[in-house]
């Protein structure tokens, strides 16, 4: 196969998460206890965890989770095949990547199997719930005598889907300098002082071209550049205040 690029994609508007909770329409003789809210996160589009607070149940109850996509050919829910447990009580469900569709409305139903009328349905936009892995393989190189370039890699997810937050500071700085880098896994620092020791770290989020996730990944492992003879010294900061 050969490839050629014809045009670049427009960045369409992305709707925010929609969460709706409802209970069954049956007439109940006694008020039903509300079910805990289900929270779902898609981890690097490798798997998804949907969890709930099982300790909010007055009695130890193995709640069941069923899910489907709004668009699916039949409207039947499928039950979770891989439950997560807390103190031997169901507290979540892990869904594998084959079952993840980011751009279809994900419908999740939590139910008390002992009281079938006690159920809650939520609708989620998974594209806004992606948490990438921390960036990896941070490498520093000199572009010129005083200019540094930092590069990194993301695993599994295309770079165009990611936005990065780069932080750096020298051993003389109290706080981090930070900036957003969109889609390109590189950043250059035009002027560095070779007498200082710099530390860099990066994190990423699935935003804004492919989704609108506000959740950042964990920080990468930090990388360092510069004089290794000067160590960070908190007392120095106090003197400079």
């Amino acid at each position: 196969w050969s490839s050629k690029v014809l045009m670049s994609s427009a960045n369409e508007d992305i709707k925010a998460d929609l969460i709706l909770t409802s209970t069954a329409p049956e007439h109940l003789s006694a008020p039903t206890l509300p079910l805990p809210e289900v929270q779902c996160f898609v981890f690097n589009i490798e798997y998804m965890n949907c969890t709930w607070n099982s300790s909010s149940e007055p009695q130890a109850t193995n709640l069941t989770l069923h899910y489907r996509y709004k668009v699916s050919d039949n409207n039947t829910f499928q039950e979770c095949s891989h439950y997560l447990f807390s103190k031997e009580i169901t507290s979540g469900c892990q869904i594998q990547k084959e079952d993840i569709q980011l751009y279809q409305t994900f419908v999740v139903q939590l139910q008390d199997p002992q009281k079938p009328q006690r159920r809650a349905v939520q609708k989620l936009n998974l594209q806004n719930l992606v948490i990438p892995r921390a960036p990896e393989n941070l490498t520093l190189s000199n572009l010129s005598e005083s200019q540094l370039e930092l590069r990194w890699k993301s695993r599994h997810i295309k770079e165009r889907c990611l936005q990065y937050l780069v932080q750096y500071r020298s051993n003389r700085d109290r706080s981090w300098t930070e900036l957003i880098v969109n889609h390109e896994p590189r950043f250059s620092l035009p002027s560095v002082d070779e007498l200082k020791r710099y530390t860099f770290r990066v994190r990423s989020r699935y935003n804004p071209i492919c989704g609108s996730s506000q959740q950042w990944s964990k920080w990468s492992q930090p990388v360092h550049w510069g004089s290794h003879t000067v160590e960070e010294n908190p007392s120095l900061f106090a003197l400079e205040a």
């Epitope: 196969w1 690029v5 014809l6 994609s9 427009a10 369409e12 589009i45 569709q101 751009y103 997810i157």
Partner: nanobody, 128 residues
């Protein structure tokens, strides 16, 4: 629900042309990869052409220079213009759609197994 409906197949003499269409609904078209595949009797389904959301296109070597894949986002329709058809192009032609190529690095546009949604197919017969 997701629907893909092919049309435009038929019988044609070698050297002739056909234009296949695939009307789609039920998914955000601008976030999906679309592919044309074909399956001749007794053979495995094979990739013919694919197009990514950004408009990037890929072709099987056997159709390069003869087939053109395109899409009309306004009407959510995929096309395959087939020129200089050969008897070996005879097959059932399917269109397929999937979102994962939009965000996954390791997505292979050529593999039928990567695609989640499929049409019913349209028959193309080329006689010599």
């Amino acid at each position: 629900q997701v629907q893909l409906q092919e049309s435009g197949g038929g019988s044609v003499q070698a050297g002739g042309s056909l234009r296949l269409s695939c009307a789609t609904s039920g998914f955000p078209y601008s976030r999906y990869c679309m592919g044309w595949f074909r399956q001749a009797p007794g053979k495995e389904r094979e990739g013919v052409a694919a197009i990514e959301p950004d408009g990037s296109t890929s072709y099987a070597d056997s159709v390069k220079g003869r087939f053109t894949i395109s899409q009309d986002n306004a009407v959510n329709t995929l096309y395959l213009q087939m020129n200089n058809l050969k008897p070996e192009d005879t097959a059932m032609y399917y269109c397929a759609a999937d979102e994962r190529c939009f965000y996954l690095k390791d997505y292979d546009l050529r593999r039928p197994a990567q695609y989640r949604y499929w049409g019913q197919g349209t028959q193309v017969t080329v006689s010599s």
